[in-house]
């Protein structure tokens, strides 16, 4: 069975979060997708979204967030460049399907951004620093203003467990699995 998981990414200021959310392409290929932050006890806040209908592999940039929807592969790529400590938080991808509720995609991302020279990688970071060159053709999409009361999400309690490898999966009652992922540039 599909498990709702939360993956933890620990990065330094200035680095790039580069993740993907997969979806059933037959159902959602051209649907509008969004990247949201979930703050404790609050409704998810949409930070960026693709165009409507979503265009295939056409980058959309909103500030430091770049979304790229690969229709033919059923993947939404999300990049958050030049990370700041205040970007730390819990994120998720959703698919807008009005008038129905937004459809949440797996996995949620727990982002932890710490101070430090991004050019001096830590022990389990890659030594290559990716500097993304954003194509000049990126566009900014307008995101739907509606937020359904049923999309209020209770953020999972913060676990004190520190899982050192992705295979050390822990199951906590009523809490999503938290997997610590090696730091990516």
């Amino acid at each position: 069975a599909t498990k709702l998981t939360e993956e933890k990414y620990e990065l330094k200021e200035g680095q790039t979060l580069d993740v993907k959310c997969d979806y059933t392409l037959e159902k959602f290929a051209s649907s509008q997708k969004a990247w949201q932050i979930i703050r404790d006890g609050e409704m998810p806040k949409t930070l960026a979204c693709t165009e409507r209908p979503s265009k295939n592999s056409h980058p959309v940039q909103v500030g430091r967030i770049i979304l790229e929807d690969y229709h033919d592969h059923g993947l939404l790529r999300v990049r958050m460049v030049n990370l700041q400590v205040e970007d730390s938080g819990l994120y998720q991808c959703v698919i807008y399907q009005p008038p129905k509720e937004p459809h949440m995609l797996f996995d949620r991302i727990r982002l932890v951004v710490t101070k430090g020279f991004s050019g001096t990688p830590g022990s389990n970071e890659n030594s290559t620093q990716n500097v993304y060159k954003i194509p000049p053709t990126t566009t900014k999409a307008l995101c739907p203003l509606y937020t359904s009361p049923r999309t209020v999400t209770q953020a999972p309690p913060k676990s004190t467990a520190d899982v050192s490898t992705p295979d050390s999966e822990i199951n906590l009652t009523n809490v999503t699995d938290i997997i610590r992922v090696p730091v990516f540039n």
């Epitope: 993956e7 392409l25 690969y70 993947l75 290559t128 990716n130 992705p166 295979d167």
Partner: antibody
Framework: QVQLVQSGAEVKKPGASVKVSCKAS????????INWVRQATGQGLEWMGW????????GQTQKFRGRVTMTRDTSISTAYMELSSLRSEDTAVYYC???????????????WGRGTLVTVSS | DIQMTQSPSSLSASVGDRVTITCQAS??????LNWYQQKPGKAPKLLIY???NLETGVPSRFSGSGSGTDFTFTISSLQPEDIATYYC?????????FGGGTKVEIK
């Protein structure tokens, strides 16, 4: 032991289908993507597509769309790749390969099966 | 699709020689480049990921460098067991694409 074990060689007639299996062991199957890569005799590597074993979602390159089906059975940590409407040019070794974490844009393959030779001949 | 052009397609060198293979992408791939080694009759093996990071257990005689569209793979001192075909692979954009391969032989 961390490994991917693939099913044995197959000989098929043009127009038929083939289903190759890839059994994972030694790691959490649902945490990493499974990719399929093929290699015709004496040729280079060609990526076919990916499978997220957790969600079951898949994606294929344009070339294989409509002909390839990627599935999984999480209870036995096994991924499958079925290719239909076979033609002689599909004769190749088919590899399954472990990709990055399911949520990461990390498309490198650090674990490979030994490959399954599929021969299409009338 | 991003085209990956590898050169040379084959080379012959002596044991102990420094061997260099180049890989050129048809557009900037933001350092999303990996290198694999494939020995005859075997599955490929990841050697280097993200341009220059050595996979665990891979000998330090293998290295990678480059940025933008031009990348280089080097074997500092060729060993008999390095006889293989080497492939580069980009993952900046889908579909993932591989170079055509470079076959390395011993003189």
């Amino acid at each position: 032991q961390v490994q991917l074990v693939q099913s044995g060689a197959e000989v098929k007639k043009p127009g038929a289908s083939v289903k190759v299996s890839c059994k994972a062991s030694g790691y959490t199957f649902t945490r990493y993507d499974i990719n399929w890569v093929r290699q015709a005799t004496g040729q280079g590597l060609e990526w076919m597509g990916w499978l997220n074993p957790n969600s079951g979602n898949t994606g294929q390159t344009q070339k294989f769309r409509g002909r390839v089906t990627m599935t999984r059975d999480t209870s036995i940590s096994t991924a499958y790749m079925e290719l239909s409407s076979l033609r002689s040019e599909d004769t190749a070794v088919y590899y399954c390969a472990r990709g990055g974490y399911t949520s990461a844009w990390r498309w490198y393959f650090d674990l490979w099966g030994r490959g399954t030779l599929v021969t299409v001949s009338s | 699709d991003i085209q990956m052009t590898q050169s040379p397609s084959s080379l012959s060198a002596s044991v102990g020689d420094r061997v260099t293979i180049t890989c050129q992408a048809s557009q900037d791939i933001n350092n999303h480049l990996n290198w694999y080694q494939q020995k005859p009759g075997k599955a490929p093996k990841l050697l280097i990921y993200d341009v220059s990071n050595l996979e665990t257990g891979v000998p330090s005689r293998f290295s990678g460098s480059g940025s933008g569209t031009d990348f280089t793979f080097t074997i500092s001192s060729l060993q008999p067991e390095d006889i293989a075909t080497y492939y580069c692979q980009q993952y900046d954009k889908l579909p993932l694409t591989f170079g055509g391969g470079t076959k390395v032989e011993i003189k």
